[in-house]
Interface confidence: medium
């Protein structure tokens, strides 16, 4: 058993049929010595008396809010949550496996630049009685500060018969150094509580590996005289790190016909313009990637050829 | 050329070669997303690797103030990786394919380090850890880790030289 926060405790249980469970001793937080009784949740059934209560925790029916009273007055509470371990593996019932970029990916994180700011998100099908708390640091043995906000519900989607809920959180490294080569990864820890079930999820990454620039901005076409060619121009996204002479991007320009089956013409360039042939009903798209480190490409920015 | 006395390097040449290094490092080990190497215990390699840190002066302001700080650190790293790529970690079994980019990568690391420090000048270099994995599978894992780390190092070096070429070239 360990303390998650004030008056909230997590009991770690090996979860299999007829498991013996864990013996837990609760102590009433009071100077009083006698006349103390214990109850669980809203039940008025007295579970025991005295300053301490010893219980055998085996299943969710044994978890909940234990309260000690004296003469009708509440003295203190202890909320017991369960963390299940099945076949040596902690349960992951609350969050959905996103399976990208690999199996058992519950948390996904992205950064728009090297400023030390990043966003993580996760999915669940659970809609109520759900709380999350997020902690983060750079490194684990000598952790350096990362400040995370509160996790918020950021999207709801219908998947078949199920509703899926996306939660996200924004974090900022306290003393970010965008020009440094990271040697210690960022660690993100999410505590998830659904009713009386506790689970924790972790992710470890370097900012450089989760970089995904915003799409290029101000994408414009300029037809060239007496030619089917056009000059495409664009600018670095506002959210990208500066100066651009240091944090450089590379770009992919694509000409795509109306039909997905049509051959795509692609040009790669480090410049912020390119000359391409504009076919009728086609569209021109541009995306960006860090020039020197192969992290994710941005989403496409597009304009029609016409 | 960046000699220890403090003259400027050939920024544009360094920029071109460092960008080539980035391309080679990624072609030598492209499948980064499919293997989380940090799960395999990094202590022996990455702890000894000369990372470019916040206080090494490789940020734009640091380069403007005194590029020698940063150039010396980059030089140290280039020598370190050049020695690792020439060690039995890469020359031993399992043998690299004849057309493997590792050979080119090795030569380019040496080329850039010589651009930064001509013969006869000496900056201190970092001790190379004695890593001699016994099993071929250990060697393979170590190669991946070294290349992964090299990708991060040359990315910072390439940014430095690109910025230098754009803003500090005579």
């Amino acid at each position: 058993i360990w303390e998650l926060k004030k008056d909230v405790y997590v009991v770690e249980l090996d979860w299999y049929p007829d498991a013996p469970g864990e013996m837990v001793v609760l102590t009433c937080d009071t100077p009083e010595e006698d006349g103390i009784t214990w109850t669980l949740d809203q039940s008025s059934e007295v579970l025991g008396s005295g300053k301490t209560l010893t219980i055998q925790v085996k299943e969710f029916g044994d978890a909940g809010q234990y309260t000690c009273h004296k003469g009708g007055e509440v003295l203190s509470h202890s909320l017991l949550l369960l963390h299940k371990k099945e076949d040596g593996i902690w349960s992951t019932d609350i969050l959905k496996d996103q399976k990208e970029p690999k199996n058992k990916t519950f948390l996904r994180c992205e950064a728009k630049n090297y400023s030390g700011r990043f966003t993580c998100w996760w999915l669940t099908t659970i809609s109520t009685d759900l709380t999350f708390s997020v902690k983060s640091s750079r490194g684990s043995s000598d952790p350096q500060g990362v400040t995370c906000g509160a996790a918020t519900l950021s999207a709801e989607r219908v998947r078949g018969d199920n509703k899926e809920y996306e939660y996200s959180v924004e974090c900022q490294e306290d003393s970010a150094c965008p020009a440094a080569e990271e040697s210690l990864p960022i660690e993100v820890m999410v505590d998830a509580v659904h009713k009386l079930k506790y689970e924790n999820y972790t992710s470890s990454f370097f900012i450089r590996d989760i970089i995904k620039p915003d799409p290029p901005k101000n994408l414009q076409l300029k037809p060239l005289k007496n030619s089917r060619q056009v000059e495409v121009s664009w600018e670095y996204p506002d959210t990208w790190s500066t100066p651009h002479s240091y944090f450089s991007l590379t770009f992919c320009v694509q000409v795509q016909g109306k039909s997905k089956r049509e051959k795509k013409d692609r040009v790669f360039t480090d410049k912020t313009s390119a000359t391409v042939i504009c076919r009728k009903n086609a569209s021109i798209s541009v995306r960006a990637q860090d020039r020197y480190y192969s992290s994710s490409w941005s989403e496409w920015a597009s304009v029609p050829c016409s | 050329r960046a000699v220890p006395g403090g003259s400027s390097p050939a920024w544009t040449q360094c920029q071109q070669l460092s960008q080539k290094l980035c391309t080679l490092a990624w072609s030598a080990h492209p499948l980064v997303g499919h293997m989380d190497l940090r799960e395999e215990g990094d202590e022996e390699t990455t702890n000894d690797v000369p990372h470019i840190q916040c206080g090494d002066g490789c940020d734009p302001q640091g380069l403007r103030d005194n590029s020698q700080f940063c150039l010396q650190r980059i030089h140290q790293g280039l020598i370190f990786y050049e020695k690792l790529l020439g060690s039995d970690i890469f020359t031993g079994e399992p043998s690299l394919l004849p057309d493997s980019p590792v050979g080119q990568l090795h030569a380019s690391l040496l080329g850039l380090s010589q651009l930064l420090q001509p013969e006869g000048h000496h900056w201190e270099t970092q001790q190379i850890p004695s890593l001699s994995p016994s099993q071929p599978w250990q060697r393979l894992l170590l190669r991946f880790k070294i290349l992964r780390s090299l990708q991060a190092f040359v990315a910072v070096a390439a940014r430095v030289f690109a910025h230098g070429a754009a803003t500090l070239s005579p």
Epitope: S115, G116, D142, Q144, S175, A176, C177, P178, A179, A180, S241, T242, P243, Y246, F247 | P50, Q53, C54, G55, D56, G57, D59, P60, Q61, G62, R64, D65, N66, Q68, F69, Q72, R73, Q76, W123, E124
Partner: antibody, heavy 126, light 106 residues
Framework: EVQLLESGGGLVQPGGSLRLSCAAS????????MMWVRQAPGKGLEWVSY????????VYADSVKGRFTISRDNSKNTLYLQMNSLRAEDTAMYYC???????????????????WGQGTMVTVSS | QSALTQPPSVSVSPGQTASITCSGR??????ASWYQQKPGQSPVLVIY???KRPSGIPERFSGSKSGNTATLTIRETQPMDEADYYC?????????FGGGTKLTVL
């Protein structure tokens, strides 16, 4: 708690040597540039030398060049200043300071000395 | 090594605003920092990057820069603000400090 603690000062004759130490605690020492600053009695601050986080690069004020050597041992979280050929004008309180790099969205990251030690007094006199 | 010039002393009545200037050739191209040093104590960073305040420094302290002159302003000056104040800038790879200004709260 983030702290710098200097030691090694004292009375020394002209031409003599001293080695100052600065023990760092409460932060990841190996990530920061460090520097020595001195202050003669009743006078202003004068920078002496600074060193990169890895220890590979150093810069000195003209007044101490060739006589003083700055170094660091990241495994011991300690900064050093070896002072040789000491002169009367080197008499001062010697402070070590951490050089913090502040990230600025313009991309130009200013430095400042955000943590200072309590200082150690060096007196050069016959 | 370019010098930074500060007035040797500035006097102010409690509750009033004190301003200390620092001027130097090409200071406009550089960032200025300001340090406070009380008698018998180590310097403390009060302003960096011309106008940024580190955490723990009261809001009464502010910095600004116009051309080649940086200014440290202390609003509602208190007796505890009595100290020497130094401006500082980086000049290429060397560091420059101003001569210091003694602030007296009358």
């Amino acid at each position: 708690e983030v702290q710098l603690l200097e030691s090694g000062g004292g009375l020394v004759q002209p031409g003599g040597s001293l080695r100052l130490s600065c023990a760092a605690s409460g932060f990841t020492f190996s990530r920061y540039m460090m520097m020595w600053v001195r202050q003669a009695p009743g006078k202003g601050l004068e920078w002496v030398s600074y060193i990169s986080s890895s220890g590979g690069s150093t810069v000195y004020a003209d007044s101490v060049k060739g006589r003083f050597t700055i170094s660091r041992d990241n495994s011991k979280n300690t900064l050093y200043l070896q002072m040789n050929s000491l002169r009367a004008e080197d008499t001062a309180m010697y402070y070590c300071a951490r050089i913090r790099l502040y990230y600025d969205s313009s991309g130009y990251w200013p430095r400042a000395f955000d943590i200072w030690g309590q200082g150690t007094m060096v007196t050069v006199s016959s | 090594q370019s010098a930074l010039t500060q007035p040797p002393s500035v006097s102010v009545s409690p509750g009033q605003t004190a301003s200390i200037t620092c001027s130097g050739r090409k200071l406009g191209d550089k960032y200025a920092s300001w340090y406070q040093q009380k008698p018998g104590q180590s310097p403390v960073l009060v302003i960096y990057q011309d106008d940024k305040r580190p955490s723990g420094i009261p809001e009464r302290f502010s910095g600004s820069k116009s051309g080649n002159t940086a200014t440290l302003t202390i609003r509602e000056t208190q007796p505890m603000d009595e100290a020497d104040y130094y401006c500082q800038a980086w000049a290429s790879s060397s560091v420059t400090f101003g001569g210091g200004t003694k602030l007296t709260v009358l």
